[in-house]
Amino acid sequence: MMTGTIETTGNISAEKGGSIILQCHLSSTTAQVTQVNWEQQDQLLAICNADLGWHISPSFKDRVAPGPGLGLTLQSLTVNDTGEYFCIYHTYPDGTYTGRIFLEVLESSVAEHGARFQIP
């Protein structure tokens, strides 16, 4: 039975040319986190594996940095980076937990962070 919940940074915004940290946190479960995958829509950005560390997709290696922790840092943001991002927690024995973050990249210098929210 899956009892965990994923807390994410929710809806966030950032300036064009800047950087942003995407973070998720899995709580309320004793399941072992085997791996966390980060995806943008249907593209794999990066994987953090408990034993083998980070794997960054070749097409994103210049703009994606691992961490902090199981999070992901996106750099040199463009308007095209606006969209949905997913953290996919592969756990044992629970299975898979998925969190969603919506990032809006703004042309202006005003970019505010949204509130956190939880996904069961």
Epitope: Q32, T34, Q35, N37, E39, D42, L44, I47, N49, A50, D51, L52, H55, F86, I88, H90, Y92, P93, G95, T96
Partner: antibody, heavy 122, light 107 residues
């Protein structure tokens, strides 16, 4: 070349245990997870679980929980799958397979052993 | 567990035919879908990973696509060496599960 070579066929009686080996060569053994998959005669593929050669961490399918044990010996680049309390419906070909690209799940199983036939019969 | 429903279970085709095999997941698996080819007495061979990425060394006549939870393997022009059984496999959540297989035979 990259390959996984499995131990030979086994015939076992119901209630016994079997231990199948999977010898890896041609790549860094500790860099890739190993899965075990079985196939009963004339049937489809059934995933049993995985082992991390790096840490020895394992993840088993619920169907096999309590009956299967996956281990590895990094000094001889070999993974093992032991199945206990064998029943006649455990008769199958057992495969080891490498998870591609040094991570789990996303890239599929790209290198497979030749299979080990395990027959359970009284 | 995520159930993978593969169709058809078997089909007959001729060399040069376009062949389509479908696989439906019982819940979302995003793009975590792999396709394998298996010939009698042999181990499976990875053809497609992540729904549509061609594994190294696999001929370009094989392709994969996805729409929601429906996945498709297409062989654009069937060759004699393609007569085999094909399996889909989801790797989104454990336990990893396979479709029941599609046997492609000679018409």
């Amino acid at each position: 070349q990259v390959q996984l070579v499995q131990s030979g066929a086994e015939v076992k009686k119901p209630g016994a245990s079997v231990k199948v080996s999977c010898k890896a060569s041609g790549y860094t053994f500790t860099g890739y997870y190993i899965h075990w998959v079985r196939q009963a005669p004339g049937q489809g593929l059934e995933w049993m679980g995985w082992i991390s050669p790096t840490s020895g961490a394992t993840g088993y399918a619920q169907n096999f929980q309590g009956r299967v044990t996956m281990t590895r010996d990094t000094s001889i680049t070999t993974a093992y799958m032991e199945l206990s309390r064998l029943r006649s419906d455990d008769t199958a070909v057992y495969y080891c397979a490498r998870d591609s690209n040094s991570v789990l799940y996303y890239y599929g199983m790209d290198v497979w052993g030749q299979g080990t036939t395990v027959t359970v019969s009284s | 567990d995520i159930e993978m429903t593969q169709a058809p279970s078997s089909l007959s085709a001729s060399v040069g035919d376009r062949v389509t095999i479908t696989c439906r997941a019982s819940q979302t698996i995003r793009r975590y879908l792999n396709w394998y080819q298996q010939k009698p007495g042999k181990a499976p061979k990875l053809l497609i990973y992540a729904a549509s990425s061609l594994q190294n060394g696999v001929p370009s006549r094989f392709s994969g696509s996805v729409s929601g939870t429906d996945f498709t393997l297409t062989i654009s022009s069937l060759q004699p060496e393609d007569f085999a059984t094909y399996y889909c496999q989801q790797s989104y959540s454990t336990p990893l599960t396979f479709g029941g297989g599609t046997k492609v035979g000679i018409r």
